[in-house]
Each structure stands twice: as structure tokens, then as C-alpha cells.
């Protein structure tokens, strides 16, 4: 080993070196949080870039660059360091059009903390391992969601467009002519029934156990779906999104109430099955796989 390499190895394995890098990263993160940084922070920025460059040079000299098994670029954690340095020099010395977009990559410096703190390294390692192990569970989840999305599509397609429409039409008004003239929410409220505080017209259905319209209103299927058109089972993709929402229990009770009002209370069976299978079983299966991967990584 050349004297330069010996010195590099000594520096690399020294605990103070790790402490220096960790402090640099944390200080850099503090500086990045500044809203309107003063001019002198520019020099501090150069100092940080210098320290990171020095760290990488030490690692390269100690371990080699890329030829060989334990060299600098063979460790994925060093890829991050390499990218950080490359972007630091790019944003500083190369005149690129949209520099602010490239400056976003400075945030990657915060991720360097992971490679320095051993506990964090374990957690992130477990996370990466779990993603690999999750592939089978993800396939199962997507398959189950797809099956139920197709069932939902068949059962509820178009149902969430049902609305309570005012009976007293003018002599020459038709549904079509009204829908063409409706622009503001006030216009809609003139013809459709809205519950107090609701942003969507009251849903209704044509089956006996679905929601009925109040006196003076008839159930019609027209206009857009609730929640600005984002809640529906009209296409496979929207149905899939609705099922994903059920699985993650993201305000699912609203979707449940809307669908039951439009389709009928019998369909609660569909929601019971989806919640039990998707929300209770699949979510916990995912958690189990993550827990297993973390346990393996710890060992």
C-alpha cells in the first residue's frame, strides 16, 4: 500500500472522521432550512461541498474507485455521495437553464445521514429488503383490488350520478336544456336537492332499499359524479381507486354511504367483504412482511 493509501485508510476508519461528516451533514441540513439565507452562506456552501469532496476522495484512495469487489462505487451508499457531489459542482460551475430545479437535488445531502448513522442504515436496509419481499404480496394485493374493482364496476357503474331533481320544470325545459345552461353552483342548487352544508346533490337510487328523494323531487341519472367527479365506479381505473381507498380506509365511510344510498343497502355485503379482506387481511400481510424483513436485517 502506498503511504497516501495508508493515510486514507487511517482517516477513514477513525471515529472522528465519521463525527466530522455527521456534524457537517446536520449543519448543512440546518442551513438548507433557511428561508432567505444571507450572502455569507454561499461560502459555507462551498465548505460543505469541500468536506464532501474530501470524504469521497479519502474513500476512493482507501478503497479504490470501481475496479475490485469493495471499491467506492460497489457500495450503493456511496452512489448517493457521488450524486451529491456531482450535483454540487453542476449547480455551481455549469451554467444550466433551470438551476432551481437542480438545486432540489441538494436535499439529497440530508440522505447522507443514513449512511453515517448505523441504526438508520439498518432500518433503510430493512425497508429495501422488504420492498423486494413485498413483490409477491403486492401482486396479490393488486390482483384482489382488480377483482373487486371489476365487481364494483359491474354493480355500481353510473350509480353515483343519480341525483334528486326538482319536479317543477318550465313548459319548454328539458333535462338536456337545463344541463346545458347550468354553470354556477347556485344554478345547480335551483334544480337539484342539496342537503345543508353539502357540496354535492343528494344521491338517490331506483331500487326499493336505496335512498329516496324528498317530496317534489325525482331521482334522475345526470351530471357528474360526487366529489368533483373523482368518486365513481364508472371505469376500471376509478373503481380501482375507490377500492384502494377502501383498503387504506381513507374516508371510506363516505364512499360506503354514497354507494349504499345510490345502489341499495343490500350492497353493504360488498363493502364488508372488501374491508375484511383488503383492509384487515392484506394490509396486515404487508405489515408482516415488512416486520419479517426488519427482523432478518437486524440478525
Amino acid at each position: 500500500f502506498s503511504p497516501l493509501r495508508r493515510i486514507s485508510i487511517k482517516i477513514l476508519v477513525h471515529s472522528l472522521f465519521s463525527m466530522l461528516i455527521m456534524c457537517t451533514i446536520l449543519t448543512n441540513c440546518i442551513f438548507m432550512t433557511m428561508n432567505n439565507p444571507p450572502d455569507w452562506t454561499k461560502n459555507v456552501e462551498y465548505t460543505f461541498t469541500g468536506i464532501y469532496t474530501f470524504e469521497s476522495l479519502v474513500k476512493i484512495l482507501a478503497r479504490g474507485f470501481c475496479v475490485g469487489e469493495f471499491t467506492f462505487l460497489r457500495d450503493p451508499w456511496n452512489w448517493l455521495d457521488f450524486v451529491v457531489i456531482v450535483f454540487a459542482y453542476l449547480t455551481e460551475f455549469v451554467n444550466l437553464g433551470n438551476v432551481s430545479a437542480l438545486r432540489t437535488f441538494r436535499v439529497l445531502r440530508a440522505l447522507k445521514t443514513i449512511s453515517v448513522i448505523p441504526g438508520l442504515k439498518t432500518i433503510v436496509g430493512a425497508l429495501i429488503q422488504s420492498v423486494k419481499k413485498l413483490s409477491d404480496v403486492m401482486i396479490l394485493t393488486v390482483f384482489c383490488l382488480s377483482v373487486f374493482a371489476l365487481i364494483g364496476l359491474q354493480l355500481f357503474m353510473g350509480n353515483l350520478k343519480h341525483k334528486c331533481f326538482r319536479n317543477s320544470l318550465e313548459n319548454n325545459e328539458t333535462l338536456e336544456s337545463i344541463m346545458n345552461t347550468l354553470e354556477s353552483e347556485e344554478d345547480f342548487r335551483k334544480y337539484f336537492y342539496y342537503l345543508e352544508g353539502s357540496k354535492d346533490a343528494l344521491l338517490c337510487g331506483f331500487s326499493t332499499d336505496s335512498g329516496q328523494c324528498p317530496e317534489g323531487y325525482t331521482c334522475v341519472k345526470i351530471g357528474r359524479n360526487p366529489d368533483y367527479g373523482y368518486t365513481s365506479f364508472d371505469t376500471f381505473s376509478w373503481a380501482f381507486l375507490a377500492l384502494f381507498r377502501l383498503m387504506t380506509q381513507d374516508y371510506w365511510e363516505n364512499l360506503y354511504q354514497q354507494t349504499l344510498r345510490a345502489a341499495g343497502k343490500t350492497y353493504m355485503i360488498f363493502f364488508v367483504v372488501v374491508i375484511f379482506l383488503g383492509s384487515f387481511y392484506l394490509i396486515n400481510l404487508i405489515l408482516a412482511v415488512v416486520a419479517m424483513a426488519y427482523e432478518e436485517q437486524n440478525q
Epitope: M157, G158, K161, F165, N167, T174, L175, E176, F206, Q212, C213, E215, G216, T218, C219, V220, K221, I222
Partner: nanobody
Framework: EVQLVESGGGVVQPGGSLRLSCAAS????????MAWYRQAPGKQRELVAY??????ISYADSVKGRFTISRDASKRVYLQMNSLRPEDTALYYC???????????????WGQGTLVTVSS
């Protein structure tokens, strides 16, 4: 294609009665509101009466107490016209808000009209 077919029109003497009927032909998933309109010569079309699936019924002031609208479980609506007057002479149209199939939106459908003439 859905069509509304009216029948029952004709010539009747003042004070007489007529029963108009309107049936929806073709594929119908759901009929919402069914109504009768009329258009007298040289006048605008006006609403006579309507009936909703929930049983809401409304009549024009000029026909209240004389005309009765009803609908049956099939795709039919009726207008029973009693104590007819010369001013009831008009072309009577049937109109329905209906869904041809479960995937289509509700639309407005009109019949071709049936002529009712009240004269002595």
C-alpha cells in the same frame, strides 16, 4: 331507440270525457317522471300534469278537478279527462324522463302527440 306512443285522442263534445294513454316502447331501464303537455293552435306548449315514481302528482290550475293523471307498473301513463271544454282543444304530448339502460344518463323523451278536439 325508445319511443313514446300516445293514443286515445279524438273529437268529443263539451262536458264529455276522454282517456289518453302513453306507452314507452323499446328498451327502458327506468322511467322517472311522466307528464302530459298540450299545445293549442297558435299558443305555447304548456304542462297539463305530471306524475313521479314516488307518487308526486301536480296539475295545471286550468285542469284541476277535471283531469286525473295516473301511471301503472308497466311503462304507461294515463290522462283521464272529464268535463271537457272547447279551450281544452289541443295537441296533447306525452313526455318522460327515462333511462334507456343502466349505463345511459336520464334523458327527456317526447311523444308525437295526439289531437283532442272539443266541439259541439
Amino acid at each position: 331507440e325508445v319511443q313514446l306512443v300516445e293514443s286515445g285522442g279524438g273529437v268529443v263534445q263539451p262536458g264529455g270525457s276522454l282517456r289518453l294513454s302513453c306507452a314507452a316502447s323499446g328498451p327502458v331501464f327506468n322511467i322517472n317522471r311522466m307528464a302530459w303537455y298540450r299545445q293549442a293552435p297558435g299558443k305555447q306548449r304548456e304542462l297539463v300534469a305530471y306524475v313521479t315514481p314516488t307518487g308526486d302528482i301536480s296539475y295545471a290550475d286550468s285542469v284541476k278537478g277535471r283531469f286525473t293523471i295516473s301511471r301503472d307498473a308497466s311503462k304507461r301513463v294515463y290522462l283521464q279527462m272529464n268535463s271537457l271544454r272547447p279551450e281544452d282543444t289541443a295537441l296533447y304530448y306525452c313526455r318522460a324522463l327515462l333511462q334507456p339502460d343502466r349505463y345511459s344518463n336520464t334523458r327527456t323523451y317526447w311523444g308525437q302527440g295526439t289531437l283532442v278536439t272539443v266541439s259541439s
